[in-house]
C-alpha cells in the first residue's frame, strides 16, 4: 500500500521564493513521519526535510545552500523555499515516509514540480520619459 502524492506541475519563483505544496492521500495527524523534498530527475539531492512527531514540534532541516521552511496540514506538507538562485531551476519531488503507527508507509513517486527561478531584472527608468498626460 503506497501513499499518493500530488504536486503542481510547474511553479515560477519570480521573487526567488516559492511555496511547494505536497498533497498526500493520507492523514498525517498524530503520525510520526518524515517528508522530504528532492532536487533533480534522479532525486539525488535532498534539499529539505520536515520531521513530524505526535509528541513534539515540527522540525525542519535545510541543506546548505537552501533556505527552507515547512508547514504541516492534515494531508499536506508545504515547503517554503526562499533565496533561490536561477541555477536551482530544476524538477523537485516530494517524498513522504510514515514510521508510526505501523505499518511503515511511503509514497509512489510523484510527477514532480518544475521550479523555474526567474532572475531579478531591474528595469532602468527611461532617460527621457514621454510627456505626462494631463
Amino acid at each position: 500500500n503506497k501513499i499518493l502524492v500530488k504536486q503542481s506541475p510547474m511553479l515560477v519563483a519570480y521573487d526567488n521564493a516559492v511555496n511547494l505544496s505536497c498533497k498526500y492521500s493520507y492523514n498525517l495527524f498524530s503520525r510520526e513521519f518524515r517528508a522530504s523534498l528532492h532536487k533533480g530527475l534522479d532525486s539525488a539531492v535532498e534539499v529539505c526535510v520536515v520531521y513530524g512527531n505526535y509528541s513534539q514540534q515540527l522540525q525542519v532541516y535545510s541543506k546548505t545552500g537552501f533556505n527552507c521552511d515547512g508547514k504541516l496540514g492534515n494531508e499536506s506538507v508545504t515547503f517554503y523555499l526562499q533565496n533561490l538562485y536561477v541555477n536551482q531551476t530544476d524538477i523537485y519531488f516530494c517524498k513522504i515516509e510514515v514510521m508510526y503507527p505501523p505499518p511503515y508507509l511511503d509514497n509512489e513517486k510523484s510527477n514532480g514540480t518544475i521550479i523555474h527561478v526567474k532572475g531579478k531584472h531591474l528595469c532602468p527608468s527611461p532617460l527621457f520619459p514621454g510627456p505626462s498626460k494631463p
Epitope: R34, A44, E46, V49, Q59, Y61, E97, M99, Y100
Partner: nanobody, 124 residues
Framework: EVQLVESGGGEVQPGGSLRLSCAAS????????MGWFRQAPGKEREFVAA????????DYAESVKGRFTISRDNAKNTVYLQMSSLRAEDTAVYYC?????????????????WGQGTLVTVKP
C-alpha cells in the same frame, strides 16, 4: 525515539590511532545522518565528521581531514570514526549525534539525539 551508544575511547600516544563506534537503535527512516562532534574542557562542542545513511555524502572538519575517516555499517546501524595521526589537541569527549536530515550536516542544531560521549586522551 533514537538511542545512541558510543564506544572505543581511551588513552593513546601522539601519532597513534583509535576507532570510535556509535550504534543507533530505534525507529529509522530511509535516510538520515549521523555525525561526530567533540568537546574539549572549557570549549564549545565542535563538528568533527558526518555521514548520511546512503553513504553518498560525508563531511569533515578542516582540522581532521586526511587523518580521520567516517564510515558506517547500515546493517548494524553503526557509524565508525577511524582516527589516526592523533595529536594532543584531539583530546576531548567525542559525542555521536543523529539527525533526520538526509545529508552530512555540520550544524550542531540539526542533531536531535546525542550519545553519552566517550573520552579520547592523547598524551605522551
Amino acid at each position: 525515539e533514537v538511542q545512541l551508544v558510543e564506544s572505543g575511547g581511551g588513552e593513546v600516544q601522539p601519532g597513534g590511532s583509535l576507532r570510535l563506534s556509535c550504534a543507533a537503535s530505534g525507529r529509522m527512516f530511509s535516510n538520515y545522518a549521523m555525525g561526530w562532534f567533540r568537546q574539549a574542557p572549557g570549549k564549545e562542542r565542535e563538528f568533527v565528521a558526518a555521514i548520511n545513511y546512503r553513504r553518498d555524502d560525508a563531511d569533515y572538519a578542516e582540522s581532521v581531514k586526511g587523518r580521520f575517516t567516517i564510515s558506517r555499517d547500515n546493517a548494524k546501524n553503526t557509524v565508525y570514526l577511524q582516527m589516526s595521526s592523533l595529536r594532543a589537541e584531539d583530546t576531548a569527549v567525542y559525542y555521536c549525534g543523529f539527525t533526520y536530515a538526509g545529508w552530512a550536516s555540520s550544524r550542531r542544531d540539526d542533531y536531535d539525539y546525542w550519545g553519552q560521549g566517550t573520552l579520547v586522551t592523547v598524551k605522551p
